[in-house]
């Protein structure tokens, strides 16, 4: 999916009001010095591409993020503010239902959510312009 035509400001507002708080809840008890951000993004569409990938695609050691509250709210925000996004996700959702697993918060998942916070932070940053 090409995130170029999303309403970035509306997504940002949704993130600040709810999604960010759910991410903090998920990370509660984790030290703020524990993880360095290694996943990066260069502009807002790219950030959303990386956020989608890290939130919804299972990875080795962390298969369960898509069922978390922050993930469901992320999906809703993208569906509302990115034209045509929900249609592209129908097949992906059906595939995900087939491989639903028990929720387990592993250290790998905590690291992945820390990376997500970093990607969202880059997405939210003001436009950094060289004067």
């Amino acid at each position: 999916y090409d995130f170029t035509n999303c309403d970035f400001e509306k997504i940002k507002a949704a993130y600040l009001s709810t999604i960010s708080k759910d991410l903090i809840t998920y990370m509660s008890g984790t030290k703020s010095t524990e993880f360095n951000n290694t996943v990066s993004c260069s502009n807002r569409p790219h950030c959303l591409t990386e956020i989608q990938s890290l939130t919804f695609n299972p990875t080795a050691g962390c298969a369960s993020l898509a069922k978390e509250m922050f993930a469901m709210k992320t999906k809703a925000a993208l569906a509302i503010w990115c034209p045509g996004y929900s249609e592209t996700q129908i097949n992906a959702t059906q595939a995900m239902k087939k491989r639903r697993k028990r929720k387990v918060t592993t250290n790998k998942c905590l690291e992945q959510v820390s990376q997500l916070q970093g990607l969202w932070r880059r997405f939210n940053r003001p436009l950094l312009k060289q004067q």
Partner: antibody, heavy 119, light 107 residues
Framework: QVQLVQSGAEVKKPGASVKVSCKAS????????IEWVRQAPGQGLEWMGI????????YYAQKFQGRVTMTADKSTSTAYMELSSLRSEDSAVYFC????????????WGQGTTLTVSS | DIQMTQSPSSLSASVGDRVTITCRAS??????LVWYQQKPGKAPQLLVY???NLQSGVPSRFSGSGSGTQFSLTISSLQPEDFATYYC?????????FGTGTKLEIK
């Protein structure tokens, strides 16, 4: 807990340079931008610029372009702000601040460094 | 550069009063606005981000609203510790300019 500790007060002569340090602790230094803001006596807040400690990328207010240099030392988790060709109008308190978790504000601030420029 | 205009520049009020400070941006900044409180000799403290989100630990008597070019900070019932100077700052693009400040004084 997150802390930003700045260097002590400075007295400089016009034309000189000053380098203010901001030592960060309690968080992953390279994950967050650092902002520099100054405040002249009895005046409001004035935004000077931002540095990305990870990349070293800087974004300066036009007013300070050519006179300010922001750097960051990853090994010591310290940000620096150097201001050159000082004049009396540069007398102010200089603050560093850390970007918030969400990237939508600056949530932790240093205690401030007082600079006096006088002949 | 985006200019931020705050009003009033100073305001006298009493403990228990409801006060509202406004901030106007010279162009559309959506919801990219923060509010800070500053007391003499201290660093600013973050109150509100994203125009309406209260920073953790900030009392619920503070609230932010607005979007586009018009924003406000409201204190529903002034407490003695609220007498300070308040600044808005836009967060849309660099340079991240501040408002001119509003000094809230005891009547």
């Amino acid at each position: 807990q997150v802390q930003l500790v700045q260097s002590g007060a400075e007295v400089k002569k016009p034309g000189a340079s000053v380098k203010v340090s901001c030592k960060a602790s309690g968080y992953a230094f390279t994950n967050y931008l650092i902002e520099w803001v100054r405040q002249a006596p009895g005046q409001g807040l004035e935004w000077m610029g931002i540095i990305n400690p990870e990349s070293g990328d800087t974004y300066y207010a036009q007013k300070f372009q050519g006179r300010v240099t922001m750097t960051a030392d990853k090994s010591t988790s310290t940000a620096y702000m150097e201001l050159s060709s000082l004049r009396s109008e540069d007398s102010a308190v200089y603050f560093c601040a850390k970007e918030s978790l969400t990237g939508s504000s600056y949530d932790y601030w240093g205690q401030g460094t007082t600079l006096t420029v006088s002949s | 550069d985006i200019q931020m205009t705050q009003s009033p520049s100073s305001l006298s009020a009493s403990v228990g009063d409801r006060v509202t400070i406004t901030c106007r941006a010279s162009e559309n900044i959506y919801s990219n606005l923060v509010w800070y409180q500053q007391k003499p000799g201290k660093a600013p403290q973050l109150l509100v981000y994203g125009a309406r989100n209260l920073q953790s630990g900030v009392p619920s008597r503070f609230s932010g609203s607005g979007s586009g070019t018009q924003f406000s900070l409201t204190i529903s019932s002034l407490q003695p510790e609220d007498f300070a100077t308040y600044y808005c700052q836009h967060f849309y693009e660099t340079p991240l300019t501040f408002g001119t400040g509003t000094k809230l004084e005891i009547k």
